[in-house]
């Protein structure tokens, strides 16, 4: 087919010789076709991954990728000739860096749905260069980890040595979807969840007097977990006194939040203090009432068949412990008046 009508985009991949890194090309088809094929939905920052807009069935791999040999030979089907390049939906993944990846890549719809579609194609001129700038020793890695439950940030490797003030406008993608609100060289994550994991792409434009290029870098982001550095905290009971009716049954609940520990041995128990004596009470088994990747809430109840006068003189103590330390909360019973 005739590629002279294809829209053209120039991209630059500057790779570090010290690291394994990947690269991607998106099939950015011109507008009305995009809706049929690889439309990247805009993503609001509040959206949770379960509610991400997924590509429709007619998007899947309805594009064909070719490479244009520099010697003028016919276009080559990427899938047949290049084992280190993988097509995933409308994205081309380069698994290994190297100047031999330089060249022209063309994508177009597989199914021609209208006469207009014949000219619907994108030509991407990719230039691949090894990184020569040694002045930036601590440039961001192409593999970045975010600690679950904490704050974190994802840096654009090609811009990480520039201050925010001098950084150009950056376009970010996550798993091929545009992150429309992100424009700086760093994405700040207020609280890390497991859905922040994925493949992030950052683009910015570099111009000289002759032409302009899109400089692109790919970052693989993992969400990782680490042991808590905090002892458990007791969520309930909050008050240290509890109004009760004598002669009536009573259940006091102790709920505690335990931070993540790789080897998890939580302790939650009730004991009673009566003047100088104290003893552990045999109570129903503890149960987990909420478990997340970051922490777990465990509940254990003490049950009194009926509240007696003697119980009003006692302190009921909930004791919780993890490998870091322990916390207690005591409750004094008080007779309800009126």
């Amino acid at each position: 087919f005739n590629i002279s009508g294809c829209s053209t985009k120039k991209l630059l991949w500057t790779y570090s010789t010290r690291s394994e890194e990947e690269f991607v090309l998106f099939c950015d088809l011109p507008e009305p076709q995009k809706s049929h094929f690889c439309h990247r939905n805009r993503l609001s920052p509040k959206q949770v991954p379960e509610h991400l807009p997924f590509m429709g069935s007619n998007d899947l791999s309805d594009v064909q990728w070719y490479q244009q040999p520099s010697n003028g030979d016919p276009l080559e089907d990427i899938r047949k000739s290049y084992p280190h390049i993988i097509q995933d939906k409308c994205t081309l993944h380069f698994l290994t860096p190297g100047v031999n990846n330089s060249g022209s890549y063309i994508c177009r719809p597989k199914m021609i749905k209208s006469p207009y579609d014949v000219a619907c194609c994108v030509k991407m001129i990719l230039e691949v260069k090894p990184q020569t700038n040694a002045s930036c020793e601590y440039s961001a890695s192409h593999k970045q980890d975010l600690l679950l439950g904490s704050t974190g940030s994802i840096s654009c490797p090609s811009l990480s040595c520039q201050s925010d003030a001098q950084s150009p406008a950056v376009t970010w993608y996550k798993n091929g979807k545009l992150l429309s609100v992100e424009r700086s060289n760093r994405i700040v994550v207020d609280e890390v969840y497991d859905y922040h994991q994925g493949t992030y792409v950052c683009d910015y434009t570099q111009s000289d007097t002759v032409s302009s290029w899109t400089v692109r870098a790919v970052v693989q982001v993992r969400t990782i977990v680490g042991d808590t550095k905090l002892k458990p905290d007791i969520l309930d009971p909050v008050e240290d006194t509890l109004e009760v009716e004598l002669g009536k049954p009573l259940t006091i609940s102790c709920k505690a939040r335990f931070g993540f520990e790789r080897v998890f041995n939580p302790v939650i128990k009730w004991y009673i203090k009566d003047s100088d004596l104290e003893w552990e009470v045999s109570v129903p088994e503890a149960k987990s009432i909420k478990s997340t990747l970051k922490d777990e809430i465990i509940e254990r109840n003490i049950i009194l068949e009926k509240v007696t006068q003697r119980d009003l003189r006692r302190k009921f103590v909930c004791f919780v412990q993890n490998s870091i330390g322990n916390t207690t909360q005591s409750v004094q019973l008080k007779e309800k008046r009126g």
């Epitope: 600690l147 497991d194 990782i224 977990v225 790789r262 990747l293």
Partner: antibody, heavy 124, light 107 residues
Framework: QVQLQESGPGLVKPSETLSLTCTVS????????WSWIRQPPGKGLEWIGY???????NYNPSLKSRVTISVDTSKNQFSLKLSSVTAADTAVYYC??????????????????WGQGTTVTVSS | AIQLTQSPSSLSASVGDRVTITCRAS??????LAWYQQKPGKAPKFLIY???SLESGVPSRFSGSGSGTDFTLTISSLQPEDFATYYC?????????FGQGTRLEIK
């Protein structure tokens, strides 16, 4: 790129204590677990134990009575001490970053970065 | 301790072949399994975690599957650089244990 480098004596006498240090460069020791693994000549891999950067440890029960793993976050290093060694402790000792990946609503642990290994021979 | 048994212990294959290595756990370990590749005189290299998730940068000819007690590592089309020893490893319970290894040789 995070890199790990083991260091320590290559020869230890029986009944003495084997001491190795692993230096982490190109990244922080914080937020990760750090493991020691060994491989006797011509054999498979055996996990010795791990330490979290905060100091929490977990050891292989088969070695627990003889093993101590410690961490020095200021130097970006963690260390292994194995007491009362015998010829059976002769092996290549590796240090590795041991990471818990939170994905698919669960945790998956993996040793994703390894040192190149150091050979320790126990002999008089 | 959970025991992991790999089979076969060694196998010979040619470039371009499809190869499958299995790892059986002595009790259920859900998906808490990783695969490593080790070449002579080198440290192991991590390939797969969570039984089936490929580490970024690992060629897509490697794939993992399985859950519970039976797991497989498949190399769809062997390349010269794939000849090595492969280990499975479980993280489901402590102590962490490895399989005895499968040595993959050139036929």
């Amino acid at each position: 790129q995070v890199q790990l480098q083991e260091s320590g004596p290559g020869l230890v006498k029986p009944s003495e204590t084997l001491s190795l240090t692993c230096t982490v460069s190109g990244g922080s020791i914080n937020n990760y677990y750090w493991s020691w693994i060994r491989q006797p000549p011509g054999k498979g891999l055996e996990w010795i134990g791990y330490i979290f950067y905060s100091g929490t440890t977990n050891y292989n029960p088969s070695l627990k009575s003889r093993v101590t793993i410690s961490v020095d976050t200021s130097k970006n290093q963690f260390s292994l001490k194995l007491s009362s060694v015998t010829a059976a402790d002769t092996a290549v000792y590796y240090c590795a970053r041991d990471v818990g990946i939170a994905a698919r609503n669960s945790y998956y642990y993996v040793m994703d970065v390894w040192g190149q290994g150091t050979t320790v021979t126990v002999s008089s | 301790a959970i025991q992991l048994t790999q089979s076969p212990s060694s196998l010979s294959a040619s470039v371009g072949d499809r190869v499958t290595i299995t790892c059986r756990a002595s009790q259920g370990i859900s998906s808490a399994l990783a695969w490593y590749q080790q070449k002579p005189g080198k440290a192991p290299k991590f390939l797969i975690y969570g039984a089936s998730s490929l580490e970024s940068g690992v060629p897509s000819r490697f794939s993992g599957s399985g859950s519970g007690t039976d797991f497989t590592l498949t190399i769809s089309s062997l390349q010269p650089e794939d000849f090595a020893t492969y280990y499975c490893q479980q993280f489901n319970s402590y102590p962490i244990t490895f399989g005895q290894g499968t040595r993959l040789e050139i036929k």
